[in-house]
């Protein structure tokens, strides 16, 4: 059963239908909506059978409508239910007010029913002008908007209407007068120099598009100097002015074609800066140092003239950057008076000249480089130098063969001596000396030195070898040793070593009393303050004892006989014969013979007598072993 159809308005442009029906009975419902006066054709809607309510939008405001509904069940239509209802009146805008007024904008507020309008149409028109209005639309949800881009101090009429798809409300209007353009704040000059000044000003942030600055020399009809600067700036450097000149500076702000009332300030630039306090001091013997004072960042450059006081024609000119306040002038003559002048240049202007006089110092000298106390590993240096000048001396030690690294010493300028140690012995060196002071390095002087050899002990020589000894000699550095120790040991180490201590001046030792024909080792050491050198060594064999042999008797006669013998050649100085009768009845006969002899006829003996004969050789004062024989004189 379909029943209880009710129709209620939904706003001014819609109706709401509600009905009751059995659940799950209907396939669909068909609804017909028609103006009661049937001006327009009816609207038909088919809605699902599950629905029990529906909104019908898009109707006319304040209009009576007839609404019918029937249901369809398996192709059957139910009886039609009908009802009548009217849509509501069109909503009006409430009120419109200007909430905030500036000099170039305002804020508009208004009231309106919620959800009534798709958008609002706002028209902004200058009153009393035929200029085209500004139009804008804002979404229907808004109740406020800013209207920028207005003219200052201007009457405006502002109209607003609410708009839906097919409807526009009656407009609401309001009139408003924009504010005057705001004035600028203070204009001040914060820095003044001789050629520039700095302007500072105050103004509301974000107000001005730009500022125009006009700089004009006071009392001059010359064209003013104009600058346009961005509206964000609050400070500006004005360069390129003349020194000592009065200026009028004006400033106005500009915003969308409007100009503020100008601010003005008067200012006088500083006088052209002067150089001051020129001081000249000596920098050693070949230079002068200039110091002066001057305003910062003022000068393009300085021109300095240096000339000997007594030589007008020979001037030296220097152009220096304007940032400098001091300069060294090198390459001058020692002990010479100089006149120094300086002026500054500022954009073509020359400052007055400052002058001063000063003399260079006496040329410092070094000389007489002397090497002394040379040892195997060191030497001493001494030199002369001008007092009170040098901060340091540089000493370079280079070996003449360039095999060693160069050694460099820096020592105090007060010193006049140096001890150089740690050098290798027996090496030639060149010593270079130069003096250093601020901005001075003297010419280098040099000397040569050769380190001593380490004391030498060498060339152990054995000479004069004989059966009973030999001579030991050696070479040694002069005055190097306090003493020498000569040690003699037999090769078989059967005998005690013999030690001989000799003075440091001796170079030879004659050894005697040794055993013939055996090997000996000789060692020689030197001593310095008790320190022993490694010994020199030599080995030697003494000669075998020279022999006299083969003593023969021949040619016996009643008063004698002939004797002959053999002996080593060149060994004996002489021979000694001793002859005595075996019964010792007569005095013995002793005969000394010269070395070359090997025979001797003996006479003056008794007949038929037996004699004992002994023979020995003498070599360097020593006797050889004796050889003997028996001989008998013949019968008479």
């Amino acid at each position: 059963e379909l029943e209880n159809l009710t129709v209620t308005e939904v706003g001014w442009d819609g109706l709401r239908l509600n009905w009751t029906a059995a659940d799950q009975a209907y396939e669909h419902f068909i609804i017909q909506v028609q103006e009661a006066n049937k001006v327009e054709a009816a609207r038909n809607l088919t809605v699902p059978g599950s629905l029990r309510a529906v909104d019908i939008p898009g109707l006319k405001a304040a209009t009576p409508y007839t609404v019918s509904i029937y249901g369809v069940i398996q192709g059957y239509r139910t009886p039609v239910l009908s009802a009548e209802a009217s849509t509501g009146e069109t909503p009006n805008l409430g009120e419109v007010v200007v909430a905030e007024v500036g000099w170039d904008a305002l804020k508009l507020n208004w009231t309106a029913p919620e959800g009534a309008y798709e958008y609002f149409f706002i028209q902004v028109q200058e009153a009393d002008t035929v200029e085209a209005a500004q139009n804008l639309t804002v979404p229907g949800g808004l109740r406020s908007t800013d209207l920028p881009g207005l003219k200052a101090a201007t009457h405006y009429t502002i109209t607003i209407r609410g708009v839906t798809q097919d409807f526009s409300t009656t407009p609401l209007s309001v009139e408003v007068l924009t504010e005057e353009v705001p004035d600028m704040g203070n204009l001040t000059v914060t820095e003044v120099s001789w050629d520039a000044l700095r302007l500072n000003w105050t103004t509301p942030d974000g107000t001005y598009d730009q500022f125009t600055i006009q700089v004009q020399e006071a009392d001059q009809v010359e064209e003013a100097h104009n600058l346009t600067v961005p509206g964000s700036l609050r400070s500006m450097e004005i360069p390129g002015l003349r020194a000592g000149t009065p200026y009028t500076v004006t400033l106005h702000g500009e915003v969308r074609g409007h100009s503020t009332r100008p601010l003005a300030v008067e200012v006088v630039t500083e006088d052209l800066p002067q150089l001051g306090d020129l001081a000249v001091s000596e920098v050693g013997w070949d230079g002068l140092r200039l110091n002066w004072t001057a305003a910062d960042n003022a000068y393009e450059h300085f021109v300095i003239q240096v000339q000997e006081v007594n030589k007008v024609e020979a001037a030296q000119n220097l152009t220096l950057p304007g940032s400098l306040r001091a300069v060294d002038i090198p390459g001058l003559e020692a002990a010479t008076p100089y006149r120094v002048s300086i002026y500054g240049v500022i954009r073509g202007y020359r400052t007055p000249v400052l002058s001063a006089e000063a003399s260079t110092a006496k040329e410092p000298e070094i000389g007489n480089l002397n090497v002394s106390d040379i040892t195997p590993e060191s030497f001493n240096l001494s030199w002369m130098a001008t007092d009170g000048i040098f901060e340091t001396f540089t000493i370079e030690i280079i070996d003449s063969n360039r095999l060693l690294e160069t050694v460099e010493y820096n020592i105090s300028g007060a010193e006049r001596t140096a001890h150089i140690s740690g050098l290798p012995p027996s090496t030639d060196f060149i010593v270079y000396l130069s003096g250093l002071a601020p901005s001075i390095r003297t010419k280098t002087i040099s000397a040569t030195a050769t380190t001593e050899a380490l004391p030498l002990l060498e060339n152990l020589t054995i000479s004069d070898i004989n059966p009973y000894g030999f001579t030991v000699s050696w070479m040694a550095s002069e005055n190097a040793f306090d003493s020498f120790l000569v040690t003699v040991v037999d090769s078989g180490k059967l005998l005690d070593p013999q030690e001989f201590t000799l003075s440091g001046t001796q170079r030879k030792l004659e050894l005697r009393g040794l055993i013939t024909g055996i090997g000996y080792e000789v060692m020689v050491s030197g001593f310095t303050q008790g320190h022993q050198t490694k010994p020199l060594r030599a080995e030697i064999v003494t000669e075998a004892e020279p022999e006299v042999d083969n003593l023969l008797v021949s040619d016996a006669t009643p008063d004698g006989f002939r004797l002959s013998w053999t002996a080593d050649e060149g060994v004996f100085d002489n021979f000694v014969l001793k002859i005595r009768d075996t019964k010792k009845q007569s005095e013995p006969l002793e005969i000394t013979l010269l070395a070359p002899e090997r025979t001797r006829d003996i006479t003056g003996l008794r007949e038929a007598t037996e004699y004992e004969i002994e023979l020995y050789g003498i070599s360097k004062g020593r006797r050889s072993q004796t050889v003997s024989a028996i001989a008998t004189t013949a019968m008479g």
Partner: antibody
Framework: EVQLLESGGGLVQPGGSLRLSCAAS????????MGWVRQAPGKGLEWVSA????????YYADSVKGRFTISRDNSKNTLYLQMNSLRAEDTAVYYC???????????WGQGTLVTVSS | SELTQDPAVSVALGQTVRITCQGD??????ASWYQQKPGQAPVLVIY???SRPSGIPDRFSGSSSGNTASLTITGAQAEDEADYYC???????????FGGGTKLTVL
């Protein structure tokens, strides 16, 4: 028993002088060479000077040459070291030592401290 | 110094240690060796080729080769912990020179 006893050390200002003595006993003093060796605090040994048996030959390290003088009095069995123009770097324990002809310093005294400071 | 020594050497108790000394003068002269314990005067332990003064134990010995001299302690004892200085001559003008010293630690 060989004994060497040093004396004369002490505190002295830079540029000042001191005389060290070494009294010897227990050996033939006149037959021995003698010397002085020093040792700066925390440092190694440094030979200073030596003298031969009769006193006719003297030897000096470069660092003290011209400022120190070694001498001996064989009649008193005493060795001396006269130290002039003293410097801070001369601060050390000074040892007296003897050596026979063919050996280095074989006996040493216990040392005397010399301090050079202002 | 004209004689160069290692500043420090260590040895385990009972082990053998060699302390060396280098210098041009050692090509000619034998080195002498001194032992110095803290607060004491030096004591001569080796001189000449390898001679020991009386009272010096035979575990101390010396040797020399070229410009290097060596002191060897065979079977080091705790009482051998000391500073050791080599010493030689550098000729008539520098009659006595000492090495910088080697500190021996017995572990």
């Amino acid at each position: 028993e060989v004994q060497l006893l040093e004396s004369g050390g002490g505190l002295v200002q830079p540029g000042g002088s001191l005389r060290l003595s070494c009294a010897a006993s227990g050996f033939t003093f006149s037959g021995s060479r003698m010397g002085w060796v020093r040792q700066a605090p925390g440092k190694g040994l440094e030979w200073v000077s030596a003298i031969n048996e009769e006193g006719g030959q003297t030897y000096y390290a470069d660092s003290v040459k011209g400022r120190f003088t070694i001498s001996r009095d064989n009649s008193k069995n005493t060795l001396y070291l006269q130290m002039n123009s003293l410097r801070a770097e001369d601060t050390a324990v000074y040892y007296c030592a003897k050596h026979p002809p063919h050996r280095p310093f074989d006996y040493w005294g216990q040392g005397t401290l010399v301090t050079v400071s202002s | 110094s004209e004689l160069t020594q290692d500043p420090a050497v260590s040895v385990a108790l009972g082990q053998t240690v060699r302390i060396t000394c280098q210098g041009d003068s050692l090509r000619l002269y034998y080195a002498s060796w001194y032992q110095q314990k803290p607060g004491q005067a030096p004591v001569l332990v080796i001189y000449g080729k390898s001679s020991r003064p009386s009272g010096i134990p035979d575990r101390f010995s010396g040797s020399s080769s070229g410009n290097t001299a060596s002191l060897t302690i065979t079977g080091a004892q705790a009482e051998d912990e000391a500073d050791y200085y080599c010493n030689s001559s550098h000729g008539p003008r520098r009659p006595v020179v000492f090495g910088g010293g080697t500190k021996l630690t017995v572990l």
